[in-house]
Amino acid sequence: QLPPGKPEIFKCRSPNKETFTCWWRPGTDGGLPTNYSLTYHREGETLMHECPDYITGGPNSCHFGKQYTSMWRTYIMMVNATNQMGSSFSDELYVDVTYIVQPDPPLELAVEVKQPEDRKPYLWIKWSPPTLIDLKTGWFTLLYEIRLKPEKAAEWEIHFAGQQTEFKILSLHPGQKYLVQVRCKPDHGYWSAWSPATFIQIPSDFTMND
């Protein structure tokens, strides 16, 4: 029977800069029941606080709700693991909410084959930003990527779309069914998960080259 091993805070994420969650990995438990607590203080302050919510983020997590989240302050946090034989502390982690945003995937992905009379046909891809993100404030710049592939192909083709919420692809294989997905990230954050795939059947009379 031993004191617990050193825990590690391995990830902090925010969906929208208004709330965030951090997760830790326990060290070895020393063969005894072990309690974990996360404590933090804001940079420039000495007063230590305990995690306000150990439930919302699931096991080994700490969730900071709106009233505990400030974009303009760096959080300095550590996890303490304690059993009957002693304690151990994780390394301190510095967290700036601005840099840990991982949004939800974009919404309303729509894919359409356009066949103008006077020009080559193309695939029109359109989407909306995730609802939790408020782009009007100017605090957020969301960037997008699209990926697509024929249904039976092994490799995806990925395109960086910048801030556009629409994208045009001209050359596609006629008669094939394509999968299309989109994801987003803030300029200083992490890519969201890919949106659910949208399928589109390319007509067999689609002009291949442009």
């Epitope: 193309y122 083709e157 045009k168 001209l170």
Partner: antibody
């Protein structure tokens, strides 16, 4: 017929400024991304900057960030590159290129030479 | 440091098949971003040859083909002709640079 015509190149001293223009004709200018790419004498191609259709989104190579500004005027069918704090290593032929889907550069101008020397 | 690596030179005799490679990394080609190929004839502006890994640009002969696998892409030219003598560049977007990368270029000589 697609035509791209760069202008504004020339001889400039280190620390000086130049503004390059790329006048486009023969298609709808506003429907495309736009790029600047440069080529130092006897060297390979180096991407400099690009600008999205809506103008609000721009990207720059690290080597020019903070010194160069890309812009576009859709009403004049013209792309610009404002180059400040020029250095000897900015000496190159500067090409403008139209960006189609996947931002592939499907048409290029003939290039304009920028020489930075004291 | 993100780079796209190409052989500096390649050569072949008329009628031969020549392949030019372009090796990237997990932040560009291996990431899934598409590869474009450009041809630059002596004294002229570059011209788009192959786009999105394997699509031939309009007007490009079918002797030119492109492919991509993993972190590499390649350009193949079959039935080599003297007018193919040029510099060839690959290009791909790079996630870590948030910018376009060009390969160093390959000078193709037709012997």
């Amino acid at each position: 017929e697609v035509q791209l015509l760069e202008s504004g190149g020339g001889l400039v001293q280190p620390g000086g400024s130049l503004r390059l223009s790329c006048a486009a004709s023969g298609f709808t200018f506003s429907s495309y991304w736009w790029h600047w790419v440069r080529q130092a004498p006897g060297k390979g191609l180096e991407w400099v900057s690009d600008i999205a259709r809506a103008s609000s989104y721009t990207n720059y190579a690290d080597s020019v960030k903070g010194r160069f500004t890309i812009s576009r005027d859709n009403s004049k069918n013209t792309l610009y590159l404002q180059m400040n704090s020029l250095r000897a290593e900015d000496t190159a032929v500067y090409y403008c290129a139209r960006g189609l889907d996947a931002r592939r550069m499907d048409y290029w101008g003939q290039g304009t030479l920028v020489t930075v020397t004291s | 440091q993100s780079v796209l690596t190409q052989p500096p030179s390649a050569s072949g005799t008329p009628g031969q098949r020549v392949t030019i490679s372009c090796t990237g990394s997990s932040s560009n080609i291996g990431y899934g971003y598409v590869v474009h190929w450009y041809q630059q004839l002596p004294g002229t502006a570059p011209k788009l040859l192959i786009y999105r890994n394997n699509w031939r640009q309009s007007g490009v002969p079918d002797r030119f083909s492109g492919s991509k696998s993993g972190t590499s892409a390649s350009l193949a030219i079959s039935g080599l002709r003297s007018e193919d003598e040029a510099d060839y560049y690959c290009a791909a977007w790079d996630d870590s640079l948030n910018g376009w990368l060009f390969g160093g270029g390959t000078k193709l000589t037709v012997l």
